[in-house]
Interface confidence: low
């Protein structure tokens, strides 16, 4: 067989035998002559090997380009391909020689010394056991052990070829530890050498590049890319890299196996690509490919090389952020930078540190924003290499949905006397200011009452106050604006001209941040009246009484109840006035009945009122004729005892003789403190020139004289103690002599 490159003017050398296959007997001499057009060489089976001196290659003598190959006393192992070729070319002629040796029909090649067959468990893969034969038409079977199994050629996927060996699907022998070929000649059995079976994996689970995604560097920096492949066990792996720059001299690739963690069924391989000093030409896509012989997996990353470090804010940075109070605010920092900048946040010029309410970093997060958090926030980015700084200011506006002041109080449940004029108010704080405050109303019987709920009243429909058909005549006064507790608040007032109908009134306030509402129960009754004695606001530990007065001719069975937590057992869905229908659920109080000519008065006395006595008290009276119960509710608020305090400063005063001095002693305390004034530690007594007003809070000295100068002390005392404040009066000028003659 001649082998040559097409179009080549060189003709393949000619062999003395015309056959492609030559069969000779063992112990005979093999001689083949080769003639050609230029220098020739021979290659024979199992070269190079120790017995090389057995093979003779000699010049022919009759021609320059002629060589004869002689092998005396051939043996079975000399079976194989004999090739004559032109030096330094691929042009050749080959003859396959079978040396028929019935004593050793299998050829042992040099590589067979290892006797290892590598297989994969892939169903589609076949493996060749290289038990080649010195006889072309042998009946060969394959023996595998342990357990012992024999495989014979089936004319399909199992076959034997004297030039190649025994071919079999690899999965069939993957269980075996060793295999060998066996041939039968004239009832004699011949075996090839033993081949150890090694199952080789091929699966690559994944290929991971680190760092992943995009890598940013500036020129001159070192690039290190790690490519880690995870494979099944018994895998051999090759890595290859693709990269943008064709200059390879500054790139270094190191491949190594990584020790697998104990107990894992995966093997790790690592290939590291290093460029000590990157240039712009190194920018681009880097691909790492892992190949296991049967499987390829790759991963890629992009390397961006900047000519120098830089820093700038991204276009998406906001200058104004609006948030609703209580919400979470996130102000992200959008920047373009290499390397990543140091980020520092400042609020109104002061640095912010992370705490449980604020988290600073790539974005500023305020967990639950409050109005206090409003202000100017500045973020300063610093490039850690160039130290270049960039700053950006964000104004945070915190919007507050309308908050209705009265809502914070216990919902007033007072009943209103028939025919009286009443005023309902809603005090609203909102930021930004309100779009509007609207009032709505609905008849009491059109709504349902569920006391256990935060919002106990449910009205299917609310009517605008302009539509007062069937209700009380209403007027909404112009909104007032007041500075309360340091906040600008809106006070909306609803005036009920005459209370004839029991209704619910709702004020609804809306601004851009949201809405707030307050529902006011307006229960109108003709009948009993509740009064508190004394009329002043009671303070704890004081004595006070609740009086329920009812016309003796109309009402009977006056009873006091306290609307305590037991009231939650009021049946669901009852209309308003449920208190009367569920008196059993209330806490009955012992009262004392007094009578005068027209009324019965039921008194509940509190000898030593405590904060626990606060709450809603119900007076129940039964109509003598109809037997219908009427209930009246009074909200009792008891002030906590407080020691006296002087709540402001008493300024020293300088005045001229004959002028008027006025000074106020600002006090607080419960019970209301008793105020006494002293001059130079002597109790001050009212006379024609000294006037004390407003419970001695105001001291006025008219037509001051020189002797009115001195140290004045204001003392406020109640049962819990006293508080004092001093002021100095300096009187200037000369006292005129008075002529009394």
């Amino acid at each position: 067989a001649s082998v040559g490159l097409p179009g080549d003017s060189l003709h393949p050398p000619k062999l003395s035998t015309q056959k492609d296959i030559l069969t000779i007997l063992a112990n005979t001499t093999l001689q083949i002559t080769c003639r050609g057009q230029r220098d020739l060489d021979w290659l024979w089976p199992n070269t190079p090997r120790d017995s090389e001196e057995r093979v003779l290659v000699t010049e022919c003598g009759d021609s320059i380009f002629c060589k004869t190959l002689t092998v005396p006393r051939v043996v079975g192992n000399d079976t194989g391909a004999y090739k004559c070729f032109y030096r330094d070319t691929d042009v050749s002629s080959i003859v396959y020689v079978y040396v028929q040796d019935h004593r050793s029909p299998f050829i042992a090649s040099v590589s067979d010394e290892h006797g290892i067959v590598y297989i994969t468990e892939n169903k589609n893969k076949t493996v060749v056991i290289p038990c080649r034969g010195s006889i072309s038409n042998l009946n060969v079977s394959l023996c595998a052990r342990y357990p012992e199994k024999r495989f014979v050629p089936d004319g399909n996927r199992i076959s034997w070829d004297s030039e190649k060996g025994f071919t079999i699907p690899s999965y069939m022998i993957s269980y075996a530890g060793m295999v060998f070929c066996e041939a039968k000649i004239n009832d004699e059995t011949y075996q090839s050498i033993m081949y150890i079976v090694l199952v080789v994996g091929y699966r690559i689970y994944d290929v991971v590049l680190s760092p992943p995604h995009e890598i940013e560097l500036s020129a001159g920096e070192k690039l290190v890319l790690n490519c880690t492949a995870r494979t099944e066990l018994n895998v051999g792996l090759d890595f290859s890299w693709q990269f943008p720059s064709s200059k390879h001299q500054h790139k270094k690739i190191v491949n190594r196996d990584v020790k697998s963690l104990p107990g894992t069924v995966a093997k790790m391989f690592l290939s590291t690509l290093t460029i000590d000093s990157v240039t712009k030409s190194d920018q681009g896509e880097y691909t790492c490919t892992a190949y296991s012989g049967l499987m390829t997996k790759k991963n890629k990353t992009f390397v961006r090389v900047h000519t120098k470090p830089f820093i700038a804010f991204g276009s998406g940075m906001k200058s104004l952020v609006e948030a609703t109070v209580g919400s979470q605010v996130r102000i992200p920092v959008k920047y373009l930078s290499y390397p990543a900048p140091d980020i520092k946040w400042y609020r109104n010029g002061r640095p912010i540190e992370s705490n449980y309410t604020m988290i600073v970093g790539d974005e500023l997060t305020i967990m639950e924003v409050s109005e206090r958090d409003a202000g100017n926030y500045t973020v300063i980015l610093t490039n850690p290499i160039s130290m270049e700084k960039q700053s950006h200011m964000v104004s945070l506006v915190v919007n507050v949905p309308p908050q209705i002041g009265e809502k914070a109080l216990i919902s007033p449940m007072d009943s209103y006397q028939y025919g009286t004029m009443q005023t309902l108010t809603c005090t609203v704080y909102a930021n930004p200011p309100l779009h509007h405050i609207q009032w709505y109303w609905q008849l009491e019987e059109a709504c349902s009452y569920r006391p256990s709920q935060t919002n106990p009243y449910t009205c299917k429909e609310w009517r605008h106050v302009k539509d007062f058909q069937g209700g009380n005549k209403i007027e909404v006064t112009k909104n007032q604006y007041a500075l309360i507790e340091g906040k600008n608040k809106t006070v909306s007032t609803l005036v009920i001209q005459a209370a004839y109908v029991s209704a619910l009134y709702k004020c609804e306030a809306i601004n851009k941040a949201g809405r707030g509402e307050r529902v006011i129960s307006f229960h109108v009754i003709r009948g009993p009246e509740i009064t508190v004695q004394p009329a002043t606001q009671p303070t704890e530990r004081e004595s006070m009484s609740l009086l329920c007065t009812a016309d003796r001719n109309t009402f009977e069975n006056l009873t006091w109840y306290k609307l305590g937590s037991q009231a939650t057992s009021v049946h669901m869905g009852e209309s308003l006035t449920p208190v009367c229908k569920n008196l059993d659920a209330l806490w009955k109080l012992n009262g004392t009945v007094f009578s005068n000519s027209t009324n019965d008065i039921l008194i509940v006395a509190f000898q030593n009122a405590s904060l626990q006595d606060q709450g809603n008290y119900v007076c129940s009276a039964q109509d003598k004729k109809t037997k219908k119960r009427h209930c009246l509710v009074k909200q009792l608020v008891i002030l906590e005892r407080m020691a006296p305090m002087i709540t402001g400063n008493l300024e020293n005063q300088t005045t001229t003789i004959g002028e008027t001095i006025e000074v106020v002693c600002p006090t607080s305390g419960n019970p209301t403190p008793l105020i006494t004034w002293f001059k130079d530690n002597e109790t001050l007594v009212e006379d024609s020139g000294i006037v004390l007003k407003d419970g001695n809070r105001n001291l006025t000295i008219r037509r001051v004289r020189k002797e009115d100068g001195g140290l004045y002390t204001c003392q406020a005392c109640n049962v819990l103690g006293c508080a004092r404040a001093e002021t100095l009066f300096i009187i200037e000028g000369v006292q005129e002599k008075t002529n009394l003659e």
Epitope: P401, H435, T458, C459, K460, K506, E517, V519
Partner: antibody, heavy 115, light 108 residues
Amino acid sequence: EVQLLESGGGLVQPGGSLRLSCAASGFTFSWYVMGWVRQAPGKGLEWVSSIYPQGGATSYADSVKGRFTISRDNSKNTLYLQMNSLRAEDTAVYYCARGNYFDYWGQGTLVTVSS
Amino acid sequence: DIQMTQSPGTLSLSPGEGATLSCRASQSVSSNYFGWYQQKPGQAPRLLIYGASSRATGIPDRFSGSGSGTDFTLTISRLEPEDSAVYYCQQFDSLPLTFGGGTKVEIK
């Protein structure tokens, strides 16, 4: 980002019923008045109904009073419109809108009443 | 019920020109409870102006509102091609809430 997504529209015979839903996200649903506004093919906008956030107070246009019921589930951030005794003149795109000022609207759902 | 009447029905103008849209209420409406909306074909309406004169979030300053009592005006100072739409006015001073019939603005 405030989003309102209506669903439940479709073809229904006169006298039939439908329930529209509006799923809200991106804002505190329980703070806002919510409403339904409809638009008949080629016509202008018509307010249908509004509901208040907590108390569940409602108001309706005369044309739907007694037939339509607005409701809301603040825990699910969802607004509903139950439409009964539907008439041919109720055919329209129904929009869900936020607030007393309808500052955000859904994309609408088409209700066709036809035999 | 408060009727809202818009005029003109259609307005055809060139880009860069100014547009004035009118809305009249059948009875006095508090300016606090008056708004303007824009609706483009196949889209939901969008709030432009609330409280008669306050611009809604994200609305360009070429849109402005004015008026009180029964007469309200929407002004578009410099028309852009994207302003081609139907504009509706609305009151919610009293129930039922009512919209105007709309003014169609066409850009030549």
